[in-house]
């Protein structure tokens, strides 16, 4: 279920997944929610001037249980992932950190006569994750009332720092803040040169511009089909960047589909999971617990529910299937998507609605009956 | 529907076949079914046949064929077609129909879920289109439903494809850039639907487009969740405990 | 009830210009595509020129393209017809028509529902 | 650009005859672009079919069309005094749009 409590001077023990930065406990734990593992995080607000590096460090963590034994520690924040909190689960976040340089590459440097003006800038930036801006206080006259555009490998600050007359944010493009405007189009059997920034295993290009859109580097994407000719890269989602932020002119290739992130999308953006289940598909990954059930959507469900499952695959093979139902297998992986997608199978795979806003009910918030 | 496949028994239990009998019984929309005794379609379906005894509504089916003479149909008790919708315009190309008597559920016959007002912004990535109508332009019915999977367009590139038309904020645009894939004559009507945080939701009804799945050409569709206050109001002014609300 | 009332016809000599103008009302001008269409004394209709409800988009016949420029103004609910460099075959009772485009079996349907009582344009020296 | 051909040029009928109208285009024409006109001396055109077949409002129904592709007819069942016109056969399928070039229903 949905925990949202927070332990103050409490630190988890153990099951570290990644050591990021952020600037407080909150953003933490949204990133913890969006981690395909982590369920439990650690956070330092404050440390002992021997580990000043230490500070703000955010401490992802998993655990086959659910929990980890808890330790005392001043300063420290510690909590659950938001993963199955529905309505609290999002992606925006407005805060602004008034004393705080959050590190990264710069790479854009721009005058701007207040914080708002610089958060806009950087909202309206393809490659802006971040910013810190120099108040007319600042101690060098040469960076006072100037906006700094960064951005880094993982999304998050490279590291923190506390400095005077320094404030820093985030861009508010997951807030749908942005002006840059979202293609939406398919390009149907095309694809992108551009620069890959990662790549994984979706089943079809639909999933591939989600897991884009909510990667934070990706700004367009090239899918390769399970028809394409190189069996290693079937379908294989490939996450692109480029320097313009735009992708290259597509290239026709049979079996490839390409798009663009909908990260700058104005209207809401997709959520963050995949509800769509795939007949025939068997989706490859670490075994987490196996249930026998009755339907695709009764297994999907299930794993929706197993706060650790990330797809599943539900059999209807002759020897799967028993009195109470068919065999509903529970997966995993260490980026949350299949290890490798078959076909044929008697059966059907999909993943679970651990992130969307809503948890699944076959009841509609409005109905029409004459009764 | 223009380059889908064959559905199946039960995969969009809210489809239904408008059909309408003079002579012969034919084939000419499709419909959803939203309630008991409710099926939303479109209006321009009645244009030159408003006659509410001339049509039969057959839910539940995979295929035409089926259609027999003894296969039960719902009959119309009431057609309300949108007070605005002109025949010269293609606005508010919606329509509610109030069934003699209320439909069973099974599980090849149930409803589809409404969208709120709120949802009209929501972006929709898992989206459907369902219908027994052409396979292409010059094509003809379809024995078996066919379903097609189809990207939301979003109306501000709809509208520079449509430079004839006004593409306004009660449509809903649907289809991938290099055509191919669309709704088609005789798929008017029907559900364009989405799957949202694990439910399907009903999002368009199948309207217009210039002709079926050509390039830079996307399926035009009445958007639903701009309509759901002339749907509650025209439910509940019909039957006065015809809505229930639960809560999500 | 939908009135169209087109003004601004008369006698000019070839090369000159005229500016025909349609009045609209009784319906949503802005929602529609508007059209002339013309006819020379004692033979068939020809059409001119069309806009679309925004006025972004505009087609002309090769008859009077580069010479006829179609305009509207929808706060006035005017339509326009600029005519320049007029010949003599551009002689003709000139009418506005309104384009209806409803909905019929998942297509556009698109005709002249009405049409104004003409204005004629005399091209002669 | 689509070429209307309408037939027969001259239509000599009695009243209470029935008329038929042809009217045949060059290329294909999708049905729903296919309209019928009736045009009396000093008027403007009049509309009396859109899509093929459908009637104009206020159109009686002695007046239907029918035909698609490239082959269109327009009929009158019986034709009154009133009736007697020219009939044009009009498509905007394609641009540029194109009338036939008529067709007059007379008194014989």
């Known amino acids: 279920g949905c925990m949202t409590q927070l332990y103050k001077n409490t630190f988890f023990r153990g099951g570290d997944l990644a050591a990021i930065y952020t600037p407080d406990a909150q953003y933490c734990q949204k990133m913890c929610t969006f981690h395909p593992r982590c369920l439990l995080f650690s956070f330092l607000a404050v440390t002992p001037p021997k580990e000043t590096n230490k500070r703000f460090g955010c401490f992802m963590k998993e655990s086959i249980t659910g929990t980890l034994p808890r330790i005392h520690r001043t300063g420290a924040i510690s909590g659950h992932s938001l993963k199955q909190c529905g309505h609290q689960i999002s992606a925006c976040h407005r805060d602004i950190y008034k004393g705080l340089d959050m590190r990264g590459s710069n790479f854009n440097i721009s005058k701007t006569d207040n914080i708002e003006e610089c958060q806009k800038l950087c909202t309206n930036n393809f490659h802006c994750q971040f910013f810190t801006y120099a108040t007319s206080a600042f101690y060098r006259p040469e960076y006072r009332k100037k906006c700094l555009l960064k951005h880094s490998a993982s999304g998050t600050p490279t590291s923190i720092k506390s400095a005077d007359n320094l404030v820093s944010g985030f861009s508010l493009k997951s807030c749908a803040l942005s002006e840059i405007g979202c293609p939406m189009d398919i390009f149907q059997h095309s694809a992108f040169a551009d620069l890959n920034v990662s790549q994984v295993i979706t089943p079809d290009a639909f999933v591939c511009r989600t897991i884009c859109t909510f990667h934070p580097n990706c700004l367009f994407f090239t899918f390769y089909t399970n028809e394409w000719e190189t069996e290693s890269q079937r379908n294989v989602c490939f996450l692109k960047t480029s320097k313009s932020g735009r992708p290259s002119p597509p290239i026709p290739q049979e079996n490839a589909i390409s798009g663009y992130s909908l990260l700058t999308c104005r209207k809401t953006r997709p959520e963050p999971c995949h509800s769509k289940i795939y007949s025939g598909v068997d989706f490859e990954g670490e075994e987490l617990n196996v249930t026998f059930v009755q339907g695709a959507d009764v297994c999907q469900e299930t794993c929706t529910k197993t706060i650790r499952c990330q797809f599943f695959i539900y059999s209807l093979l002759p020897q799967d299937c028993k009195e109470e139902g068919c065999k509903c297998s529970l997966r995993l992986s260490t980026d949350g998507s299949p290890t490798r997608i078959t076909y044929g199978m008697q059966g059907s795979s999909g993943y679970s609605l651990r992130l969307c806003k809503l948890v699944d009910s076959p009841d509609c918030t409005t109905k029409i009956n004459a009764r | 529907i223009v380059g889908g496949t064959n559905a199946s028994l039960g995969e969009w239990p809210w489809q239904v076949s408008l059909q309408v009998k003079l002579v012969s019984q034919t084939h000419l929309c499709g419909g959803s079914i939203i309630g008991r005794q409710w099926v939303l379609t479109a209006a321009h379906c009645f244009d030159g046949i408003p006659y509410p005894d001339v049509w039969r509504i057959y839910g539940g089916i995979l295929s035409l064929s089926e259609i027999t003479k003894e296969t039960p149909s719902s009959r119309i008790k009431e057609l309300i077609i949108h007070q605005e919708y002109k025949v010269s315009e293609g606005n508010y190309d919606i329509a509610l129909i109030k069934l003699q008597t209320p439909l069973n559920y099974t599980e090849f016959q149930k409803p589809i879920c409404l969208p709120s007002k709120a949802d009209t912004n929501t972006i929709y990535t898992n989206c459907w289109v369902t219908g027994w109508g052409y396979t292409k332009e010059q094509g003809e019915t379809q024995n078996i439903l066919q379903k097609a999977t189809i990207p939301l367009v979003p109306n501000e590139e709809c509208q520079k494809k449509y430079r004839d038309y006004v593409i306004n904020k009660q449509m809903i645009c649907a289809g991938y850039k290099e055509g191919g894939t669309d709704a088609c004559k005789g798929d008017s009507g029907g559900p364009l639907v989405c799957k949202h945080s694990g439910r399907w939701q009903l999002v368009g009804i199948t309207s217009w487009g210039e002709g079926c799945a050509r390039k830079d050409q996307p399926g035009v569709y009445t958007k639903v969740s701009e309509y759901m206050d002339w749907i509650l109001e025209k439910t509940q002014s019909s039957d006065v405990r015809a809505l229930e609300t639960s809560s999500a | 009830e939908v009135q169209l009332l087109e003004s601004g016809g008369g006698l000019v000599q070839p090369g000159g210009s005229l500016r025909l103008s349609c009045a609209a009302s009784?319906?949503?001008?802005?929602?529609?595509?508007m059209t002339w269409v013309r006819q020379a004394p004692g033979k068939g209709l020809e059409w001119v020129s069309y806009i679309s409800p925004s006025g972004g988009h505009t087609i002309y016949a090769d008859s009077v393209k580069g010479r006829f420029t179609i305009s509207r103004d929808n706060s006035k609910n005017t339509l326009y017809l600029q005519m320049n460099s007029l010949r003599a075959e551009d002689t003709a009772v000139y009418y506005c028509?309104?384009?209806?485009?409803?909905?019929?079996?998942?297509?556009?349907?698109?005709?002249?529902?009405?049409w104004g009582q003409g204005t004629l344009v005399t091209v002669s020296s | 650009e689509i070429v209307l051909t309408q037939s027969p040029g001259t239509l000599s009928l009695s009243p209470g005859e029935r008329a038929t109208l042809s009217c045949r285009t060059s290329?294909?024409?999708?049905?729903?672009?296919l309209a019928w006109y009736q045009q009396k001396p000093g008027q403007a055109p009049r509309l009396l079919i859109y899509?093929?077949?459908s009637r104009a409002t206020g159109i009686p129904d002695r007046f239907s069309g029918s035909g698609s592709g490239t082959d269109f007819t327009l009929t009158i069942s019986r034709l009154e005094p009133e009736d007697f016109a020219v009939y044009y056969c009009?498509?905007?399928?394609?641009?540029?749009?194109?009338f036939g070039q008529g067709t007059k229903v007379e008194i014989k």
């Open positions: 290329q294909f024409v999708n049905s729903n672009y």
């Open positions: 009009q498509q905007s399928s394609r641009t540029p749009w194109t």
């Open positions: 028509a309104r384009v209806a485009r409803g909905i019929a079996a998942r297509s556009r349907t698109s005709y002249f529902d009405y």
């Open positions: 899509g093929a077949s």
């Open positions: 009784g319906f949503t001008f802005s929602h529609y595509l």
